[in-house]
Interface confidence: medium
């Protein structure tokens, strides 16, 4: 049985052209975890295999740094980066948890608008 | 002045489809995401999921994935949500609502009610 | 996905009164930056849901200082100080931190 549950940084605004750290944790099960899957909509993000470390995917790599842990730290935002993205953890016996998280990129203007909302 | 004009009332047959419209005007449409917000029996809200009109990028609430395809046409500045393989359970009045950074919703449409009956 | 609980479910009131209504959540609203999205709506027969807070605390333009918010984590509350015939109709909280959103099941603020 699937007693795990994923928790994560929870939606969030970022400033275009600055970073951010997506994180997920998973908590409540003894299952190891095997591998960490990071997606945005359809494209595979990384990877972080237990044996094996990680993996960016080449077309992201000047953009995504792996960690710290096993979450992912985005680069050099920009507008189009607003979406949701995804953390699945593959366990053992447990099979597949996965965390959602929704980024919003903002116009630096509009940040400057908003800021009681913006990131440290 | 921001406004959200959607499409009339509906009255559609089981199993057939629908598609309602919302049109902004006032604002950079595609500076913010467009949501959809269903309200059933006068009462209960449910977020049904957003679509992000500067690349197409959709989010889903799960409930929905299936049931409702969220897209926009930035010319004309309207998104739309068409809703599949009705049922009664799928009879609301159904909302667009623009989110603001902070995650709030800061203006919405004025709602567009779906009888799905045969 | 995170549960919004509201209370009351109905809340009979007569002009002038003050009254509370408590929004809470299963977990906590605070993001990992510390941001915490907790917005309020009134919902008035034949309207649209409006905007009141947002930000837990923060009034929507043209909204009366008679509103106000409140609260951190998963506890929150909208008071609302001397009731007027306008302020009748459903009130919403939505917690916009965790995927899906999720609202709570409003509260009918009516006359006594």
């Known amino acids: 049985m699937m007693t795990g549950t994923i928790e994560t940084t929870g939606n969030i605004s970022a400033e275009k052209g600055g970073s951010i750290i997506l994180q997920c944790h998973l908590s409540s099960t003894t299952a190891q975890v095997t591998q960490v899957n990071w997606e945005q909509q359809d494209q595979l993000l990384a990877i972080c295999n237990a044996d094996l470390g990680w993996h960016i995917s080449p077309s992201f790599k000047d953009r995504v740094a792996p960690g710290p842990g096993l979450g992912l730290t985005l680069q050099s935002l920009t507008v189009n980066d607003t979406g949701e993205y995804f953390c699945i953890y593959h366990t053992y016996p447990d099979g597949t948890y996965t965390g959602r998280i929704f980024l919003e990129v903002l116009e630096s203007s509009v940040a400057e608008h908003g800021a009681r909302f913006q990131i440290p | 002045e921001v406004q959200l004009q959607q499409s009339g009332p509906e009255l559609v047959k089981p199993g057939a489809s629908m598609k309602i419209s919302c049109k902004a005007s006032g604002y950079s449409f595609t500076g913010y995401t467009m949501n959809w917000v269903k309200q059933s029996h006068g009462k209960n809200l449910e977020w049904i999921g957003l679509i992000n009109p500067y690349n197409g990028g959709t989010s889903y609430n799960q409930k929905f994935k299936g049931k409702a395809t969220l897209t926009v046409d930035k010319s004309s500045s309207t998104a739309y949500m068409e809703l599949l393989s009705l049922t009664s359970e799928d009879s609301a009045v159904y909302y667009c609502a623009r989110r603001n950074y902070g995650y709030y919703f800061d203006y919405w449409g004025q709602g567009t009610t779906l009888t799905v009956s045969s | 996905d995170v549960v919004v609980t509201q209370t009351p479910l109905s809340l009979p009131v007569s002009f002038g009164d003050q009254v509370s209504i408590s929004c809470r959540s299963s977990q906590s609203l605070a993001n990992s930056y510390g941001n915490t999205y907790l917005s309020w709506y009134l919902h008035k027969p034949g309207q649209s849901p409006q905007l009141l807070i947002y930000g837990i605390s923060n009034r929507f333009s043209g909204v009366p200082d008679r509103f106000s918010g409140s609260g951190s984590g998963t506890d929150f509350t909208l008071k609302i100080s001397t009731i007027k015939p306008e302020d009748l109709g459903m009130y919403y909280c939505?917690?916009?931190?965790?995927?899906?959103?999720?609202f709570g099941a409003g509260t009918k603020l009516e006359l006594k």
């Open positions: 939505l917690q916009g931190t965790h995927q899906p959103l999720t």
